[in-house]
Amino acid sequence: MAVTACQGLGFVVSLIGIAGIIAATCMDQWSTQDLYNNPVTAVFNYQGLWRSCVRESSGFTECRGYFTLLGLPAMLQAVRALMIVGIVLGAIGLLVSIFALKCIRIGSMEDSAKANMTLTSGIMFIVSGLCAIAGVSVFANMLVTNFWMSTANMYTGMGGMVQTVQTRYTFGAALFVGWVAGGLTLIGGVMMCIACRGLAPEETNYKAVSYHASGHSVAYKPGGFKASTGFGSNTKNKKIYDGGARTEDEVQSYPSKHDYV
C-alpha cells in the first residue's frame, strides 16, 4: 500500500513538475525590465526564450519572435536546449511511469518489469528536473552578469547634458516557475526510485519446507522466510536500504548547488 502511494504521489508530483517546466519554457517573462530607476515607465519590456515583448501603458502589447538562430547568444541556445531536453525526458518518463503504476494492470506484466519501469521513469524525472534547474540557473546567472554590467554602464559617461537610460533586466516569473517545477520533477523522480525498491521482488524467497522426523510431524520454517516477508532484520536488506537513503540525500542536495547561481 505504501509503495503504491509513494509511486502514485511520485507520478503526480512529476506530472505537475513537467507541466511547470513546459509552462516556464513557453512563458515570455524570463527577464523583465528593472523598474528601480523608473517605476512609472510608459513602456515595459520583458523577454522569453522565444520572443521579446513590449507592453505599453496604453494597454497594447507587441511581441516579436527571435527569427534568427545564429544571431542569438550561445547561452540562450544552451538554456533552450536544456529546457527542451528536460521536457522530452519528462514526457518519456511520464509515458513509462503510466505503465509502471502498480494500480494499473496491463496484461500479465510482472512486478519486476514494473519495478524496472518505475526506476527508469524515476531516473528520467531526476534528469529532467536537473535539466530544468540547470537551464533556469544558467539564464539567471546570465541576467545577474548583464544586470551589473548595465549598472556599471549606467553610471559612466553621464558628463553630457543628454542622458541615455540603459534598460536593465531582472528575474522574471518564468525563472521561479522553472525552479519550482524542476524541483518538483526531481522530488517526483526520487519518490519513483524509492517506490521501485518496494516493487522489486526479494532475491531470496525460501519456500516453507516440511521435515518429517521420526514419530513427530514438525513443520520447520527457516529464518530466511521471515526476512523475505519484510519483517525482522536482514543485514543485506538493511545495507541496501541505507545505501538507498544516502543516494536520496545526495540527489536532493545536488541541485541546491545551482539554486544560488
Epitope: 510608459a42 519590456n45 505599453e56 496604453s58 497594447f60 541615455t164
Partner: antibody, heavy 118, light 113 residues
C-alpha cells in the same frame, strides 16, 4: 465610430472641487488607456493623468498628484477626473483623450473650458 | 522628468514651402525592447482639439496626408511638411510617450508669411 465628450462645470470657485466626466463610445475601455490633458489660455498642452487599459495603473503629473484623481466607470463608459482645492491657475480647457498604440493619443474630446474665479 | 524643447516657436511660411520643425528631448526616447522611439507629433488649430499626426517618431497615423513625415532617433526629432498646404497653418506639438509624466513641447506655430 469613436467619440469622446467632456462634461463638467464651466465656472468653479477657488478651493472648490472640480469633477470632470469623459463619456466615450465606439471602443472597449479595457483595450485602451485614457488620459486627461489641459491647455491654459494661449499656452501649451499639459498632460495631467492617465488610467491604463486594464484600469490597474494610474499615472499623474507629479506636481499635481495630491489634488488629482482619475477613475473609471466601466458600466457607464466614463472616465472621471477629480481636482480638489481649485486655484485660478487651473483655469484651462480640459481634454480627455484615448491612448493608443505607441502611447499616442489618437482620439480627443472637443474639450471643456473651466474658469476658476471667485 | 523628460524635458521637450521645440524650435522654432513661430515659423512663417508660404503655401508650397518645405517646413521643418525640430524637437529635442532631455533623455533618449528610444526603447531598446522594440527599437522604437516613443515620440508623437500633434497638430492643433485654434479652438479645436489636437489631432494625432505621427507616433513612434515616424509612423504616420491613418488618414494623415503623406506630406507629413517624422524622423529622428534618441533625443533629436524632426517633423517635415514637404509642401505646405493652406490647411496646414496650425500649431504643432511634440510629446514624450516613453516615460511618465508624458511631457509636451512648447509648440511651434506655423503662420502665413
Amino acid at each position: 465610430q469613436v467619440t469622446l465628450r467632456e462634461s463638467g462645470p464651466a465656472l468653479v470657485k477657488p478651493t472648490q472641487t472640480l469633477t470632470l466626466t469623459c463619456t466615450f463610445s465606439g471602443f472597449t475601455f479595457s483595450s485602451y488607456g485614457m488620459s486627461w490633458i489641459r491647455q491654459p489660455p494661449g499656452k501649451a498642452l499639459e498632460w495631467l493623468a492617465t488610467i491604463s487599459g486594464g484600469g490597474s495603473y494610474t499615472y499623474y503629473l507629479d506636481s499635481l498628484k495630491d489634488r488629482f484623481t482619475i477613475s473609471r466607470d466601466i458600466s457607464k463608459n466614463q472616465v472621471v477626473l477629480t481636482v480638489t482645492n481649485m486655484d485660478p491657475a487651473d483655469t484651462a480647457t480640459y481634454f480627455c483623450a484615448r491612448q493608443s498604440r505607441g502611447n499616442a493619443m489618437d482620439y480627443w474630446g472637443q474639450g471643456t473650458t473651466v474658469t476658476v474665479s471667485s | 522628468d523628460i524635458q521637450m524643447t521645440q524650435s522654432p516657436s513661430t515659423l512663417s511660411a508660404s503655401v508650397g514651402d518645405r517646413v521643418t520643425i525640430t524637437c529635442k528631448s532631455s533623455q533618449s526616447l528610444l526603447n531598446s525592447g522594440n527599437q522604437k522611439n516613443y515620440l508623437t507629433w500633434y497638430q492643433q488649430k485654434p479652438g479645436k482639439a489636437p489631432k494625432l499626426l505621427i507616433y513612434w517618431a515616424s509612423t504616420r497615423e491613418s488618414g494623415v496626408p503623406s506630406r507629413f513625415s517624422g524622423s529622428g532617433s534618441g533625443t533629436a526629432f524632426t517633423l517635415t511638411i514637404s509642401s505646405l498646404q493652406p490647411d496646414d497653418f496650425a500649431t504643432y506639438y511634440c510629446q514624450n510617450d516613453y516615460s511618465y509624466p508624458l511631457t509636451f513641447g512648447g509648440g511651434t506655430k506655423v503662420e502665413i508669411k
